[in-house]
């Protein structure tokens, strides 16, 4: 029984968001799933051999804002996404890379083939 | 227009060594990285390894570590693969390939054959 | 190393017709894979990478999709000009590895 004047409203519990995860999984996960009160994330950038390589996985709510506002790093192409909408969102998100800058080109812009 | 241009044919006696070279037009050449493939018919492709034209670091498949050498000349935009102690294994296409995120263009293919 | 298995070598097709390459990875990869076309004679070409996303200029009839370790390249309304080898690669971890290919060939 609640005792007189005790709040009968539940206490806010941090939200539970299951994301999928590689590359950036806790030892502790099971088939690629972490878990956050924060945000999933996708990402994309170039690695050391200028491959488009992606990792994705959980950003907890503190900083997570920051993070995912995907500020440009001079020297660097990545980009990333965030969502909360649902478990595993980020299986859906689709980041792209930056173009890239105009004096990484001789003649004007590259043409694939 | 990015184009990789690489020597149509190179014939070799076994034992021998060969480089092979890759002139890179149409972009800065420092800016992508330069991959290796190797393509037997009938074998598929294999990866040899990557350099980075800007710092000359490298990257290599284990299998190529003793076979294969990655080199740039920047004045000439060029990049060159030694390939050392030739066998007939080693007779194969050989590409080179540049790359940069979402930009990936390929060589024109030299053709290795190591007979005596 | 991880192996990329295409384990159909061949698959037959119509013009007009759908077709899906398939490419299996012998551990998770994430997304990190591509697909190449080569024509006999001809260097490769890529056409995707992170496994959906297709390369500037590649027609939107080649679509890839797949995670983990099950990936497919779909040909929708197959052209004359799309018959050629096709590789998947992974690039999750070196040494980068390629599938054996898979040949399209007219019915």
């Known amino acids: 029984k609640k005792e007189d004047g005790e709040s009968t409203a539940p206490t806010p519990r941090p939200k539970v968001l299951r994301c999928k995860c590689h590359h950036h999984c806790p030892e502790d996960s099971v088939n690629n799933i972490c878990s956050t009160d924060g945000y999933c994330f996708t990402m994309i950038e170039e690695d050391d051999s200028g491959l488009p390589v992606v990792t994705s996985g959980c950003l907890g709510l503190e900083g997570s804002d920051f993070q995912c506002r995907d500020t440009p790093i001079p020297h660097q192409r990545r980009s990333i996404e965030c969502c909360t909408e649902r478990n595993e969102c980020n299986k859906d998100l689709h980041p792209t890379l930056p173009p890239l800058k105009n004096r990484d080109f001789v003649d004007g812009p590259i043409h694939h083939r | 227009q990015v184009q990789l241009q690489q020597p149509g044919a190179e014939l070799v006696k076994p034992g021998a060594s060969v480089k092979l070279s890759c002139k890179a037009s149409?972009?800065?050449?420092?800016?992508?990285?330069m991959h290796w493939v190797k393509q037997r018919p009938g074998r598929g492709l294999e990866w040899i390894g990557r350099i980075d034209p800007n710092s000359g670091g490298t990257k290599y498949n284990e299998k190529f570590k003793s076979k294969a050498t990655l080199t740039v000349d920047k004045p000439s935009s060029t990049a060159c693969m030694q390939l050392s102690s030739l066998t007939s294994e080693d007779s194969a296409v050989y590409y080179c390939a540049s790359r940069r995120g979402d930009i990936d263009v390929w060589g024109t293919g030299t053709t290795v054959t190591v007979s005596s | 190393d991880i192996v990329m298995t295409q384990s159909q070598k061949f698959m037959s097709t119509s013009v007009g017709d759908r077709v899906s390459v398939t490419c299996k990875a012998s551990q998770n990869v994430g997304t990190n894979v591509f697909w190449y076309q080569q024509k006999p004679g001809q260097s490769p070409k890529a056409l995707i990478y992170?496994?959906?996303y297709r390369y500037s200029g590649v027609p939107d009839r080649f679509t890839g999709s797949g995670s983990g370790t099950d990936f497919t390249l779909t040909i929708s309304n197959v052209q004359s000009e799309d018959l050629a080898d096709y590789f998947c690669?992974?690039?999750?971890?070196?040494?980068?590895?390629f599938g054996d290919g898979t040949k399209l060939e007219l019915r």
């Open positions: 992170a496994a959906s």
């Open positions: 690669q992974q690039y999750d971890s070196y040494p980068l590895t």
């Open positions: 149409g972009y800065t050449f420092t800016t992508y990285w």
